[in-house]
Amino acid sequence: RPSFSLVEDTTLEPEEPPTKYQISQPEVYVAAPGESLEVRCLLKDAAVISWTKDGVHLGPNNRTVLIGEYLQIKGATPRDSGLYACTASRTVDSETWYFMVNVTDAISSGDDEDDTDGAEDFVSENSNNKRAPYWTNTEKMEKRLHAVPAANTVKFRCPAGGNPMPTMRWLKNGKEFKQEHRIGGYKVRNQHWSLIMESVVPSDKGNYTCVVENEYGSINHTYHLDVVERSPHRPILQAGLPANASTVVGGDVEFVCKVYSDAQPHIQWIKHVEKNGSKYGPDGLPYLKVLKHSGINSSNAEVLALFNVTEADAGEYICKVSNYIGQANQSAWLTVLPKQQAPGREKEITASPDYLE
């Protein structure tokens, strides 16, 4: 059984998932058909830049030139219109900048409404910009193979856009997927482009295809579901995670803890703290503070994000995961450097987590 003292912190708000995309309105670049367009990726300290259009990776071709932080489109056509993004990958994090490209003969004046805030929709479904379906968030779709323990809930997502707004339907093994095809049926969240199956059983194994369509086109995406029989064991944590990290004062840092657990896991992020100048309580046990834990109000508990760090944030961070069978924990160290000192690659420190057991 774990034994430690917890410092109460009732003011702790549940962490929001880190925002990895810009929060201001996307810039719109307008070009007439046949014109050339050049856009500069407005991100700082970009070591590696990757580009996407409508969520799909964009590579160079005979009309698209990618040079450093610049994207050039030669002889633009209406098909080049869409939501573009450049992502800068850095050592500590990655950041994405979005912008719109509109290749059209007529320069649209936008809504007639007196919107003085300048906030326009990314895509105005009521406008005349008719558009075939497209994926809006391919990150949510990258994991095609889902191996899920029996009795768990499975969710497949196909976030899409288009004008008019497309409809979504689901196929199982290439055929229409009907409610009566599985005991307990399934749920569809059209507003989140998702299919949800609760309490899966081996007969749910198969290929699930979302078909998203409107009058201008159709796209589809297939997931493979494998349902594995339960084999109870305590949580398994991926070796090497969380990894040691270093950042400067005022910087941001993320610790990741990859968990495999057949039974429902409970994740806690814990840090040693001092109380009344002491690291240990009267019972000789260390003071520990739960920074984040899985639950209704906490999304993505496997990630602990620290923003605007101070020297006081330095120290050991423990990822503790438990289920009804047992528990496991691994830890990493955060080094906070003064502003003038650039963070380098941290030498691996092997931390023994035994004291938590």
Epitope: Y21, I23, L83, D121, F122, V123, Q179, R189, N190
Partner: antibody, heavy 123, light 107 residues
Framework: EVQLVESGGGLVKPGGSLRLSCAAS????????LSWVRQAPGKGLEWVGR??????????DYAAPVRGRFTISRDDSKNTLYLQMNSLKTEDTAVYYC??????????????WGQGTLVTVSS | SYELTQPLSVSVALGQTARITCSGD??????VDWYQQKPGQAPVLVIY???DRPSGIPERFSGSNSGNTATLTISRAQAGDEADYYC?????????FGGGTKLTVLG
């Protein structure tokens, strides 16, 4: 504290326009879909429309009675949601609430509500 | 258009169990959420995704949804539970609310 605060309500003549604002605080505004819900005096709740988060495309959906007359927009840099109401009718008289989805992408339930702002359409 | 039907009113004796129904065509294939609204106040989410409770909502509140009917169950009813209750689901990309049920706690 997670909070939504509506403003901009008031008395307006039929055919007129009004713009409501909803200021958010205490959460990462840009991550969430947001809706407007209204409630006529002594009546039930009626959904007006919603706007998705930027990462979900930032697109909007509207209820049939307001489609073409109302426009929902958001300014993530100001943590503010807007409802532009044009061609107002007497039946648009209601308390207007802004509401936030329970989680950024997994739930459609409205977990956070503002206190509401009253819009009265009368000649 | 899709409709959710609720009884106008439901009465329950103090300490007893109240059940409020919400019916709609093939409602079991959609998730249903429930809201409590007291006079002069904004609605409060009490059940989401058919049967999940937000933090701070007592265990006395529970939900179920299958076939064409969703049910909100309030066990050991208290005077403070007296309020209007609304079910909510979706019709494609539109939110749909039930007409609301006034719960009266007797005694």
């Amino acid at each position: 504290e997670v909070q939504l605060v509506e403003s901009g309500g008031g008395l307006v003549k039929p055919g007129g326009s009004l713009r409501l604002s909803c200021a958010a605080s205490g959460f990462t505004f840009s991550s969430y879909a947001l809706s407007w819900v209204r409630q006529a005096p002594g009546k039930g709740l009626e959904w007006v429309g919603r706007i998705r988060s930027r990462i979900e495309g930032g697109t909007t959906d509207y209820a049939a009675p307001v489609r073409g007359r109302f426009t929902i927009s958001r300014d993530d840099s100001k943590n503010t949601l807007y409802l532009q109401m044009n061609s107002l009718k007497t039946e648009d008289t209601a308390v207007y609430y802004c509401a936030r989805d329970r989680s950024p992408s997994d739930s459609s339930a409205f977990a956070i509500w503002g206190q509401g702002t009253l819009v009265t359409v009368s000649s | 258009s899709y409709e959710l039907t609720q009884p106008l009113s439901v009465s329950v004796a103090l300490g007893q169990t109240a059940r409020i129904t919400c019916s709609g065509d093939n409602l079991g294939s959609q998730y249903v959420d429930w809201y409590q609204q007291k006079p002069g106040q904004a609605p409060v989410l009490v059940i989401y995704d058919d049967n999940d409770r937000p933090s701070g909502i007592p265990e006395r509140f529970s939900g179920s949804n299958s076939g064409n009917t969703a049910t909100l169950t309030i066990s050991r009813a208290q005077a403070g539970d007296e309020a209007d209750y609304y079910c909510q689901s979706w019709d494609s990309l539109s939110v749909v609310f039930g007409g609301g049920t006034k719960l009266t706690v007797l005694g």
